[in-house]
């Protein structure tokens, strides 16, 4: 058993049928010695008397808010949560496996640049009685500071019969140098509590591996005289690290017909312009990627050919 | 501690092309190592990230773009002095700081070259003959060093009398390649910045 926060405790259980559970001793936070009784949640049934209460915690029915009273007055509370260990592995019931980029990916994180700011998000089908708390650091043995905000509900989607909820959090490394070569990964730890179930999820990454630039901005077409060709131009996104000559991007320019089946023409360039043939009803899209370290491509920025 | 804006003209910067070749070569070599050594811990998540140049060179600091010198977090106290007569400095306006930057890159390349050659000698003794260093990568390191053209003491190749532990050597190869790829990215960024300035 360990303390998650004041008056909230996590009991770790080896979770299998007929498991013996864990013996837990609760102590009433009071100078009083006599006439103390204990109850669980809203029940008025007295579980025991005295300054301490010993319980055998086996299942969720044994978890909850234990309260000690004296003469009708509440003295203190202890909330017991359960953390299930199923055959050597901590349970992952609360969050959905996003399966990208690999199985058992519960937290996904992205950064728009090298400033040390990043966003993580996760999915659940649970809509109520759910709380998250996020901590982060650079490295784990001698951790350096990363500050995270509060996790917020960022999207709701319908997936078949189920509703899916996306939560996200923004974090910022306290002293980040965009040009630094990372040798210690960023660690992100999410505590999740659903009713009386506690779970924790972690992700470890280098900022360089989670870079996904914003799409190029100011995408424009300039028709070339007496030609079906157009000059496409764009700019680096505002959110990208500067100077751009040091943090350079490479670009992919795509001409896509109206129908998805039509052949796509693609050009790769390090410049911020390209000459392409504009077909009728086609659209031109441009996306960006770090020129020197192949992390994710940005989303597409698009303009119609007409 | 930083790169000045007054640097060589774009057409006068022969190192850019070599640094791009270097990044391509080390990336290909790392990919090959990850595929060949699939039963060894060779992914970024599995290896310890070690920098063999730590406390010996200060490339990131010496080559910091002027725009980032206002960032407190980028100003590291490590100071290293270097020789300053490289041929990539194709302009008389080249400052001392830029020379320091390029000589730091040269020292990095020299250290990695020695490590890779020593490692290759061990790998050639492996009866499994599982993996060797790409000669193209070694050649590209050499080309960039020649383009930088710094006079510096030659570091003798390390020779070891004891029987090599091939498992450990292959893991060290992975660690070295990951670190060298990161340094090659920094070198490419620096060359691109100098070329544009």
């Amino acid at each position: 058993i360990w303390e998650l926060k004041k008056d909230v405790y996590v009991v770790e259980l080896d979770w299998y049928p007929d498991a013996p559970g864990e013996m837990v001793v609760l102590t009433c936070d009071t100078p009083e010695e006599d006439g103390i009784t204990w109850t669980l949640d809203q029940s008025s049934e007295v579980l025991g008397s005295g300054k301490t209460l010993t319980i055998q915690v086996k299942e969720f029915g044994d978890a909850g808010q234990y309260t000690c009273h004296k003469g009708g007055e509440v003295l203190s509370h202890s909330l017991l949560l359960l953390h299930k260990k199923e055959d050597g592995i901590w349970s992952t019931d609360i969050l959905k496996d996003q399966k990208e980029p690999k199985n058992k990916t519960f937290l996904r994180c992205e950064a728009k640049n090298y400033s040390g700011r990043f966003t993580c998000w996760w999915l659940t089908t649970i809509s109520t009685d759910l709380t998250f708390s996020v901590k982060s650091s650079r490295g784990s043995s001698d951790p350096q500071g990363v500050t995270c905000g509060a996790a917020t509900l960022s999207a709701e989607r319908v997936r078949g019969d189920n509703k899916e909820y996306e939560y996200s959090v923004e974090c910022q490394e306290d002293s980040a140098c965009p040009a630094a070569e990372e040798s210690l990964p960023i660690e992100v730890m999410v505590d999740a509590v659903h009713k009386l179930k506690y779970e924790n999820y972690t992700s470890s990454f280098f900022i360089r591996d989670i870079i996904k630039p914003d799409p190029p901005k100011n995408l424009q077409l300039k028709p070339l005289k007496n030609s079906r060709q157009v000059e496409v131009s764009w700019e680096y996104p505002d959110t990208w690290s500067t100077p751009h000559s040091y943090f350079s991007l490479t670009f992919c320019v795509q001409v896509q017909g109206k129908s998805k089946r039509e052949k796509k023409d693609r050009v790769f360039t390090d410049k911020t312009s390209a000459t392409v043939i504009c077909r009728k009803n086609a659209s031109i899209s441009v996306r960006a990627q770090d020129r020197y370290y192949s992390s994710s491509w940005s989303e597409w920025a698009s303009v119609p050919c007409s | 501690r930083n790169l000045p804006v007054a640097t060589p003209d774009p057409g006068m910067f022969p190192c850019l092309h070599h640094s791009q070749n270097l990044l391509r070569a080390v990336s290909n070599m790392l990919q090959k190592a990850r595929q060949t050594l699939e039963f060894y811990p060779c992914t970024s998540e599995e290896i310890d990230h070690e920098d063999i140049t730590k406390d010996k060179t200060s490339t990131v600091e010496a080559c910091l773009p002027l725009e980032l010198t206002k960032n407190e977090s980028c100003l590291n106290s490590r100071e290293t002095s270097f020789i300053t007569n490289g041929s990539c400095l194709a302009s008389r306006k080249t400052s001392f700081m830029m020379a320091l930057c390029l000589s730091s890159i040269y020292e990095d390349l020299k250290m990695y070259q020695v490590e890779f050659k020593t490692m290759n000698a061990k790998l050639l003794m492996d009866p499994k003959r599982q993996i060797f260093l790409d000669q193209n990568m070694l050649a590209v390191i050499d080309e960039l060093m020649q383009a930088l053209n710094f006079n510096s003491e030659t570091v003798p190749q390390k020779s070891s009398l004891e029987e090599p532990d091939f498992y450990k050597t292959k893991i060290k190869l992975c660690i070295l390649l990951h670190a060298f790829r990161i340094r090659a990215v920094t070198i490419d960024r620096v060359m691109s910045y100098l070329n544009a300035s």
Epitope: D14, P17, E59, K85, E86, G88, I89, D93 | -
Partner: antibody, heavy 115, light 112 residues
Framework: QVQLVQSGGGVVQPGRSLRLSCAAS????????MHWVRQAPGKGLEWVAF????????YYADSVKGRFTISRDNSKNTLYLQMKSLRAEDTAVYYC????????WGQGTMVTVSS | SYVLTQPPSVSGTPGQRVTISCSGG????????VKWYQQLPGTAPKLLIY???QRPSGVPDRFSGSKSGTSASLAITGVQAEDEADYYC????????????FGTGTKVTVLG
């Protein structure tokens, strides 16, 4: 006393279907994940499928994906394996088993796929 | 399709120590826990070892398990006639959990 009692096995022709049941007692069935494991005559153990405690997630071996469906009825304390498009290589003793560091197995039920 | 490899058979005389190996990889035994089962003819498997080296109550202390790197082993110190059975190791793969990975199985024969 934890008990898993299996039923539903038998002889079936290739291409046909069969449903196995596993009735649980002596524990809170709705709190635990469950597996199906099979063993062909004279062969080793092969994992078939897994279902989470609440039925929210199901996992299958590649050899049965798309043909077998694992399900549970927590109100009846029963685990099921619906087997469709049966093949000769599905002939085996099928076991249900609880998930956890200490596990409990059913007695096994024989499924024979033969024309 | 078995990724956990065991010797097909091992044998020993009563009182001898016999060991069964179970060889896997970094993504299974290398990063997950191992169990060992005993299966007597015509019966369901019985758990002998969980969590690499833990013995459930009721299992004789002559059975012990260990794990090192990507391999695990089961030792029977002072093998007895009633130990003649098939033995299976079981682990998970970190990418496909909770799918069970079973070893190929080892037939233990007690001679004499």
């Amino acid at each position: 006393q934890v008990q898993l009692v299996q039923s539903g096995g038998g002889v079936v022709q290739p291409g046909r279907s069969l449903r196995l049941s596993c009735a649980a007692s002596g524990f809170t069935f709705s709190s635990y994940g469950m597996h199906w494991v099979r063993q062909a005559p004279g062969k080793g153990l092969e994992w078939v499928a897994f279902i989470r405690y609440d039925g929210s997630n199901k996992y299958y071996a590649d050899s049965v994906k798309g043909r077998f469906t694992i399900s549970r009825d927590n109100s009846k304390n029963t685990l099921y394996l619906q087997m469709k498009s049966l093949r000769a290589e599905d002939t085996a003793v099928y076991y249900c088993k609880t998930h956890g560091s200490h596990d409990n197995w059913g007695q096994g039920t024989m499924v024979t796929v033969s024309s | 399709s078995y990724v956990l490899t065991q010797p097909p058979s091992v044998s020993g005389t009563p009182g001898q120590r016999v060991t069964i190996s179970c060889s896997g990889g970094r993504s299974n035994i290398g990063s997950e826990t191992v169990k060992w089962y005993q299966q007597l003819p015509g019966t369901a498997p019985k758990l002998l070892i969980y969590g690499n080296d833990q013995r459930p109550s009721g299992v004789p202390d002559r059975f012990s398990g260990s794990k090192s790197g990507t391999s695990a082993s089961l030792a029977i110190t002072g093998v007895q006639a009633e130990d003649e059975a098939d033995y299976y190791c079981q682990s998970y793969d970190r990418g496909t959990h909770p799918a069970l990975l079973f070893g190929t199985g080892t037939k233990v024969t007690v001679l004499g």
